[in-house]
Interface confidence: low
């Protein structure tokens, strides 16, 4: 799947703060994702769309169902992370279980961390339900293990 690129790189809210401290529960929780030399952080995100049903059309990228859902999800992520160093998403996969969506997000290095990715996505769930008719649940975000595998297909420029 080709990467969907955002056409902006404004400063993220998450990088501008005068908080004295925001202690994570563990020392590693607030670290940024493992990075490539290109200055890009990658995050793996999965979630359920509970108001949709999985069928074989979601295994075939040429079908209308696949393309419409992929377009809506891509547009949704461009909206959610519009204010920051979001570079794009890739590797959208659909799995059974209502519809389970798995994808990879790319951000400019240092602009966001795994918890902020999850936070902003969770904040957007209600809006997504009305704007895209997607009822989102079971959100999970994790750092992409380093080294980032070449076959993952997230060819995002630095």
């Amino acid at each position: 799947t080709p990467t969907t690129l955002a056409s902006h790189s404004t400063k993220t809210d998450a990088s501008s703060t005068h908080h004295s401290s925001v202690p994570p529960l563990t020392s590693s929780n607030h670290s940024t994702s493992p990075q490539l030399s290109t200055g890009v952080s990658f995050f793996f995100l999965s979630f359920h769309i509970s108001n949709l049903q999985f069928n074989s059309s979601l295994e075939d990228p040429s079908t209308d169902y696949y393309q419409e859902l992929q377009r809506d999800i891509s547009e949704m992520f461009l909206q959610i992370y519009k204010q920051g160093g979001f570079l794009g998403l890739s590797n959208i996969k659909f799995r059974p279980g209502s519809v389970v969506v798995q994808l990879t997000l790319a951000f400019r290095e240092g602009t966001i961390n795994v918890h902020d990715v999850e936070t902003q996505f969770n904040q957007y769930k209600t809006e997504a339900a009305s704007r895209y008719n997607l009822t989102i649940s079971d959100v999970s975000v994790s750092d992409v293990p380093f080294p980032f595998s070449a076959q993952s297909g997230a060819g995002v420029p630095g």
């Epitope: 993220t12 998450a14 501008s16 909206q79 519009k82 920051g84 918890h115 999850e118 904040q123 209600t126």
Partner: antibody
């Protein structure tokens, strides 16, 4: 230092529209989001909506059809428009700076009082 | 929408004593890392003032007699020792998801 100042019409006739401007200083709208909150006299706070640094907007679902939030980064101004005002929209309207990604609000304007009456 | 219920609605505390305000959410406002619950103080004729962010972090410039705790659905704001200038209405706010909501407020009077 950080400051926000709301300016509005004060009095709005029923069924008319409301426009409020929030002018900010001490920070850039390209770095921080701004929220709108209202408070009827003697009552609690109600979140209306938010515009993020990149321009993405979010609204209170109960008021979404009546609200529009926009901004002009170069003028350091955020705008709230609300359609079809009724008497229950009478309130103090505040703009507040989003502290950062956690969406607490660390600086507030003094508010502008809006009365809906004929 | 997540509903925040504050208790008590109003109460009075003697100078120097401890004031405790509760905020209960209709569903969890926490993730594995953070508790998305904030506390504000509002005095008559003034806008709200941020006291505590992320449940327990003291905002810069706020006296150390204010503290916050809790996770999941139950949160507490403590003021100790209470001073006269603490007479105000206190609100909790969540930002776990949209829409953000506020609690109904707790009015604190000083005896």
């Amino acid at each position: 230092q950080v400051q926000l100042k709301e300016s509005g019409p004060g009095l709005v006739a029923p069924s008319q529209n409301l426009s409020i401007t929030c002018t900010v200083s001490g920070f850039s709208l390209t770095d921080y989001g701004v929220n709108w909150v209202r408070q009827p006299s003697g009552k609690g706070l109600e979140w209306l909506g938010e515009i993020w640094a990149g321009g993405t907007t979010f609204y209170n679902s109960a008021l979404k059809s009546r609200l529009t939030i926009t901004k002009d980064n170069s003028k350091s101004q955020v705008f709230l428009e609300m359609n079809s005002l009724q008497s229950h929209d009478t309130a103090m309207y505040y703009c507040a700076k989003r502290l950062n990604w956690d969406s607490s609000m660390d600086y507030w304007g003094q508010g502008t009082s809006v009365t809906v009456s004929s | 929408d997540i509903v925040l219920t504050q208790s008590p609605a109003s109460f009075a505390v003697s100078l120097g004593q401890r004031a405790t305000i509760s905020c209960r959410a209709s569903e969890s406002v926490s993730t594995s890392a953070y508790n998305f619950l904030h506390w504000y103080q509002q005095k008559p004729g003034q806008p709200p003032k941020l006291l505590i962010y992320l449940a327990s972090n003291l905002e810069s410039g706020v006296p150390a007699r204010f503290s916050g705790s809790g996770s999941g659905t139950d949160f507490t704001l403590n003021i100790h020792p209470v001073e006269e200038e603490d007479a105000a209405t206190y609100y909790c706010q969540h930002s776990r998801e949209l829409p953000y909501t506020f609690g109904g407020g707790t009015k604190l009077e000083i005896k």
